[in-house]
């Protein structure tokens, strides 16, 4: 794959700031007038006036007219104003915006509850593999085998507490250390962040929404996975979360507290426990050799069940192996001994749909994948369709300035600060960060808010998802109480250090930057973000895992030379950008890669053939249909309420629309075919609430 | 009712081999330990072992180990004991015993006893 | 094995009276102890077994106490029928082991 896609024309040319074609040299003017040969195309290229030198963004000669795709769409209100409605329409724009509010809670709440019940599903599918991710002797020794079973298990399982919880039982046990635990925890905060990738990947759709979306996605995946980056090395080196965590919980003396406020969930549960309930135990035995457990399934049948405890005699196959001494006899024959055995009988069964269905449980799973993932799309596209008619004009202005606009000077820096504590607070509310990056995609989509502005909250909501960890641990029982709080702190300290490293000096805001630069290349490659998806959340962490359990001299083997692979070609990306002078010819731009090195164009005509079965017509029963249809094939035609018709901006594709305001792709190589872009499409006349 | 029945006085000389049978009758043959304990004469009460009829699963006391063997024959409900090399010592009443209470090895069930005599 | 040690090995008394028979086991036996009552010629007979559960059919003037490595029988009140030797026996470990037996006769 190429180190950036289309990294042909990135030849800055120090002297003058110009750009012309892949071949010019900086001590060359004349060259200026070769032809761009990266795309295999004939047209010439125009010298344009580039970015400062620390810049590596490639612009292309712009008309004025045309808009950043990174700045906000101005949401035009098309509507009669209110001053200009007479009483009744007054009472009817009242009584629509009281009706828009209300679906718009309605289609938030089941938005979340598939999103509970899609975490359900990935558990009902891939549980019992995830927890045998766990029963893996290796984690102990291997910290990167322990980074990426915490990704694939927290993948799986779609909840990071769920994994975070099986680490804490793990370690209370004494099955885990708890420095083999810090890097699964690092591993879980990575696999938490797909659940708002696989969101935004609902807004395929519109090419501008889905650029913005995925890149809000995408910031926390960028965040974490660069965290684990720099932080995972100084905790093999250094163990400072092992160290501070430990001292803080040797210096309280804490007492069992109170289980972390369920406040979401006691909305959510009543209808979420219709659909299924799952027994999550049977993860955590398995995760811990649990021979039986192997066999059971998550799926909860009982849900009332009377626990008797009571001695039995059983046999032993000696008096050494009684459970005391005087508990110890025998009939002549064999010997015997007294168990505490707790008997359960069974009372009332659950109230769910596959209670009595008795399927297995990745049938269970196919089926809720399915179901959960159309409602996610179907309330996500009523989520943005219904946003969009409300925020419109006035409202739209009132809430982006709100949202958007930092405190005035000297304390503009303590805006993204007070984000960081908004996005605490509200994760802390709904007690998962899941669900608030989720809710945020598709406001980032819809141009309610700024990815710059996401970012904090985004950290925000990975601090606020460790605090309630934090008072969980708290209410752990005596045994479970000082591994749990630990691990809890370490996930804690994890993030504020991501954030230390990540968010203070606006220079190290690289998620922002990276997160812009995918969502260039994912809105004009749909299908990159899928493989983008696949890539960094199954095929790395997995390559990582069968390597790491082939031994680790195989996995330095593999795993050095692909390092120095990405370190060179950063290096050298550096030094084109900045000093190209000191590399030779050949090296100062990629043309001496072949096309498919570095450009995604090649690929894309691959997968154009792959999903030719979809690019003739696009027709389909709904909408949901059609955005997965258009993420697979990028097809010309898509459908718009059961029919078929020319999407506008897919008719535009063709025109390269040139990008403005270079400082928002600062340090990112961004080609052509990543900036198609078009003007957000015109609404209809609708009432606006307010 | 439960009953056991064991068989004949018995006189060996020393070095010989004797045989005790006990028949059962009154419970299912095969669902209780049958244990063999004998008494010498103004003696007291010495197990010798024990044998499960179910299975065949045979327990003895290490004093007697490879000079008794117990069996069981299912097919007539009767449970032998033989005890080889005898010598004068070996001179007592046996008897065959069952424990009903399941688990235990307090035996509640008692044949009438076999006098052995050992003598020359 | 375990060394199973009555006392006393004969006692006389009359009728009506209380009688205690003591057992010491050599090592903890836990509540494994059964008492059992054999008159002359006749095969013995269970009266008590984990340590102080009586068989069925005998009488309550018979009881029995004691865990670990001390027992005890007791006769609330000798009767002329009481007259015979009792055993006590563990069954705790293999082999099982009886006491030396105490010999009970009436004045």
């Known amino acids: 794959m190429a180190p950036w896609p289309e990294l042909g024309d990135a030849q800055p040319n120090p002297d003058k700031y110009l750009e012309g074609a892949a071949g010019q040299q900086p001590t060359a003017p004349d060259k200026s007038k070769e032809t761009n040969k990266t795309d295999n195309t004939e047209a010439p290229v125009t010298k344009i006036e580039l970015l400062p030198s620390y810049s590596t963004a490639t612009l292309i000669d712009e008309p004025t007219e045309v808009d950043d795709p990174w700045n906000l769409p101005t949401l035009q209100d098309s509507g009669i104003k209110w001053s200009e409605r007479d009483t009744k329409g007054k009472i009817l724009c009242f009584f629509q915006g009281i009706g828009r509010l209300i679906l718009l809670l309605g289609f938030l709440y089941f938005f979340v509850c598939s999103l509970d019940i899609l975490s359900s599903a990935f558990q009902l599918v891939g549980g019992k593999m995830a927890g045998q991710f766990f029963s893996n002797s290796s984690i102990m020794s291997n910290p990167l085998l322990g980074l990426v079973i915490g990704v694939l298990v927290t993948v799986l399982v779609q909840s990071s507490s769920t994994s975070t919880s099986i680490v804490v039982s793990m370690v209370s046990s004494s099955l885990l250390t708890v420095r083999a635990a810090i890097p699964i925890i690092m591993g879980a905060n990575i696999g938490t962040s797909i659940t708002n990738t696989i969101v935004a990947l609902m807004q395929v759709g519109d090419r501008s929404e889905f650029r913005r979306a995925f890149a809000g996605a995408t910031v926390h995946d960028f965040f974490n996975w660069l965290s684990v980056l720099v932080l995972l090395p100084v905790e093999v080196a250094t163990h400072y979360l092992e160290i501070i965590t430990q001292l803080i919980v040797e210096s309280f003396h804490f007492k069992n507290g109170e289980d972390a406020p369920d406040l979401l969930k006691v909305i959510t549960k009543p209808f979420t426990k219709l659909i299924v309930q799952l027994d999550k135990k049977v993860i955590s035995q398995i995760a811990m050799n649990d021979e039986k457990a192997k066999n059971k399934s998550l799926v909860k049948i009982w849900c009332k069940t009377f626990t008797n405890k009571t001695q039995i005699n059983v046999t032993v196959p000696s008096t050494a192996n009684c459970t005391s001494p005087s508990l110890c006899w025998t009939d002549g024959i064999q010997n015997w001994t007294m168990k505490n055995v707790t008997y359960k009988e069974n009372i009332a069964k659950c109230q769910h749909i596959f209670v009595n269905f008795h399927l297995p449980d990745l049938a269970v799973g196919t089926i809720l994948l399915i179901l959960s993932l159309l409602v996610l799309c179907g309330c996500l596209i009523m989520i943005v369709k219904i946003l969009g008619s409300v925020l419109k004009g006035q409202v739209a202005t009132v809430i982006k300035k709100t949202i958007n606009t930092d405190f005035p000077f000297p304390f503009a820096w303590l805006t993204g600060y007070l984000a960081i504590l908004v996005g605490a607070g509200m994760t802390f509310i709904v007690q998962s960060s899941s669900v608030f990056t989720s809710a945020l995609t598709p406001l980032i989509g819809i141009g309610v808010i700024t990815i710059e502005r996401a970012y904090p909250l985004t950290l925000g909501s990975n601090i606020g998802t460790t605090t309630t960890a934090i008072l969980a641990a708290l209410a752990s029982p005596g045994n479970a109480l000082r591994s749990s709080l630990q691990i809890a702190l370490c996930h804690f300290f994890f993030n504020i250090s991501g954030i230390l490293l990540w968010y203070p000096i606006p220079f190290t805001r690289l998620p922002i930057r990276m997160a812009k630069g995918l969502g260039n290349i994912s809105a004009k490659y749909r299908w990159f973000a899928v493989f983008y998806l696949i890539i960094f959340f199954f095929l790395i962490p997995l390559t990582v895992f069968g390597l790491s359990l082939a031994g680790w001299r195989v996995l330095v083997g593999v795993g050095v030379p692909v390092v120095f692979i990405i370190i060179l070609v950063l290096c050298l990306r550096l030094l084109q950008s900045r000093c190209p002078r000191v590399l030779p010819k050949k090296l100062q731009n990629w043309n001496f890669l072949p096309l498919w090195m570095r450009s995604l164009k090649p690929w894309d005509a691959v997968v154009s053939k792959f999903t030719g079965c979809f690019q003739m017509r696009c027709c389909c029963c709904c909408r949901v249909c059609c955005r997965a249809c258009c993420l697979l094939c990028d097809c010309p035609k898509c459908c718009r309420c059961s029919k078929c018709c020319e999407d506008l901006e897919e008719a535009q594709e063709g025109q390269d629309v040139p990008v403005k305001a270079p400082e928002t792709f600062d340090n990112i190589t961004i080609s052509r075919e990543a900036q198609g872009e078009v003007p957000a499409s015109d609404s209809k006349t609708e009432c606006t609430a307010l | 009712q439960v009953q056991l029945v064991q068989s004949g006085a018995e006189v060996k000389k020393p070095g010989a081999s004797v045989k005790v049978s006990c028949k059962t009758s009154?419970?299912?043959?095969?669902?209780?330990?049958m244990h063999w304990v004998r008494q010498a004469p103004g003696q007291g009460l010495e197990w010798i072992g024990a044998?499960?009829?179910?299975?065949?699963?045979?327990s003895y006391n290490q004093k007697f180990k490879g000079r008794v063997t117990m069996t069981a024959d299912t097919s007539t409900s009767t449970v032998y004991m033989e005890l080889s090399s005898l010598r004068s010592e070996d001179t007592a009443v046996y008897y065959c015993s069952i424990s009903t209470i399941i688990t235990t090895g307090a035996v509640d069930y008692w044949g009438q006893g076999t006098l052995v005599t050992v003598s020359s | 094995d375990i060394q199973m040690t009555q006392s006393p090995s004969s006692l006389s008394t009359s009728v009506g009276d209380r009688v205690t028979i003591t057992c010491k086991a050599s090592q903890d036996v836990g509540t494994a102890v059964a008492w059992y009552q054999q008159k002359p010629g006749k095969s013995p007979k269970l009266l008590i077994y984990w340590t102080s559960t009586r068989h069925t059919g005998v009488p309550s003037r018979f009881s029995g106490s004691g865990s670990g490595t001390d027992f005890t029988l007791i006769i609330s009140s000798l009767q002329p029928e009481d007259v015979a030797t009792y055993y006590c026996?563990?069954?705790?470990?293999?082999?099982?082991?009886f006491g030396g037996g105490t010999k009970v006769e009436i004045k």
């Open positions: 044998i499960y009829p179910g299975s065949g699963d045979t």
């Open positions: 009154g419970y299912t043959f095969i669902t209780y330990n």
């Open positions: 026996q563990q069954y705790s470990r293999i082999p099982l082991t």
